[in-house]
């Protein structure tokens, strides 16, 4: 009997109620492999999810996130709110990065500017909420009489104070 079931292709299930005949998956269900005893319920993309690929008898639906949200999880199993560059998501919504930190994406968190002095370099371009600092040559590499256009980066990593 097991051998009969193994003959059932993807898109069908082995129906015990019908002498193990291969029956098509019912609407809104699928089987992606052969020999299945049941079909799986199709994923529904609703709420903050939108459909990227419709469910078929042999493959599950695939979801994306609606505008203003981004996917998390191996198969976009979650949607998280976007923020602007220079912000991060907190309990109080999207908040600007604290001084000394930046976020160049619509997702993720604010992280400290690179500390140029740790590599013996100077700050060539100051950091902003949206961009990291750009490190330049070390002060010793500068020609005599020349000086860095901007002060060196803070010696310690900046912390986050509650807003």
């Amino acid at each position: 009997l097991q051998d009969l079931c193994s003959n059932c292709p993807a898109g069908t299930f082995c129906d015990n109620n019908r002498s193990q005949i291969c029956s098509p998956c019912p609407p809104n269900s699928f089987s992606s492999a052969g020999g299945q005893r049941t079909c799986d319920i199709c994923r529904q993309c609703k709420g903050v999810f939108k459909t990227r690929k419709e469910c078929s008898s042999t493959s599950n639906a695939e979801c994306d996130c609606i505008s203003g949200y981004h996917c998390l999880g191996a198969e976009c199993s979650m949607c998280e709110q976007d923020c602007k560059q220079g912000q991060e998501l907190t309990k109080k919504g999207c908040k600007d990065c604290c001084f000394g930190t930046f976020n160049d994406q619509k997702r993720g968190i604010c992280r400290p500017w690179t500390n140029c002095s740790l590599d013996g370099k100077s700050v060539l371009v100051n950091g902003t909420k949206e961009r990291d600092v750009v490190c330049g040559p070390s002060p010793a590499d500068l020609s005599p009489g020349a000086s860095s256009a901007t002060p060196p980066a803070p010696a310690r990593e900046p912390g986050h104070s509650p807003q």
Epitope: L72, G73, A74, S77, M78, E80, E88, L89, T90, K91, K92, C98, T101, Q105, R107, G108, I109, C110, R111, P112, T114, E157, G159, H160, P162, Q163
Partner: antibody, heavy 117, light 109 residues
């Protein structure tokens, strides 16, 4: 579907360096995610070790910072952990994970590393 | 000591409700994430953000928070919910991660 797989040489002797690699499949390591290492000693809780971005930028757990190096190889779609001067206290299951805004949304199955002479 | 504090263990009768708490200064500003871990398996994310469940996580799992305390509630606990549960958030720096010590949930009956 993104999947992570840890691999390493197995047992490590005290004072030696532990080396592990995490292979990323079903997606690019150059996506806008960070890639973390987390460990769990037998019968104990989870401990975050550190993380890396595809640019090579890293952050480490301060308690391990002096011994940890995390690197990334975008051409092989993998990232690696090195932990130096290991002791028996470093015996643990080591997990790699994908991190997004503090959410570890995809995990490897973990690999047990035993430190023993 | 961990920057996120959890009770080590809690038990609940089958079908009843259990609440797990997680305390830490960073939780005043940022939400905790919650992970379920069964023996010999990798952790699985069950709650993130204010009270969001990944697809596939049953709606008996929910989260709430107040001040510096985050809570995970299992309403109508099932035998398969027996596991260790870890909260996670940022450490004091704001850009590194930390886990709570974990809470072992035992489902009785």
């Amino acid at each position: 579907q993104v999947q992570l797989q840890e691999s390493g040489p197995g047992p490590v002797k005290p004072s030696e360096t532990l080396s592990l690699t995490c292979a990323v499949s079903g997606g690019s390591i150059s996506s806008s995610h960070w890639w973390s290492w987390v460990r769990q000693p037998p019968g104990k809780g989870l401990e975050w070790i550190g993380e890396i971005y595809h640019s090579g930028r890293t952050y480490y757990n301060p308690s391990l910072k002096s011994r940890v190096t995390i690197s990334v190889d975008t051409s092989r779609n993998q990232f690696s952990l090195k932990l130096s001067s290991v002791t028996a206290a470093d015996t643990a299951v080591y997990y790699c994970a994908r991190e997004d805004g503090g959410i570890m949304d995809v995990w490897g199955q973990g690999t047990l590393v035993t430190v023993s002479s | 000591s961990s920057e996120l504090t959890q009770d080590p263990a809690v038990s609940v009768a089958l079908g009843q409700t259990v609440r797990i708490t997680c305390q830490g200064d960073s939780l005043r500003r940022f939400y905790a994430s919650w992970y379920q871990q069964k023996p010999g398996q990798a952790p699985v994310l069950v709650i993130y953000g204010k009270n969001n469940r990944p697809s596939g996580i049953p709606d008996r799992f929910s989260a709430s928070d107040s001040g510096n305390t985050a809570s995970l509630t299992i309403t109508g606990a099932q035998a398969e919910d027996e596991a260790d549960y870890y909260c996670s958030s940022r450490d004091r720096s704001g850009y590194r991660w930390v886990f709570g010590g974990g809470t072992k949930v035992t489902v009785l009956g």
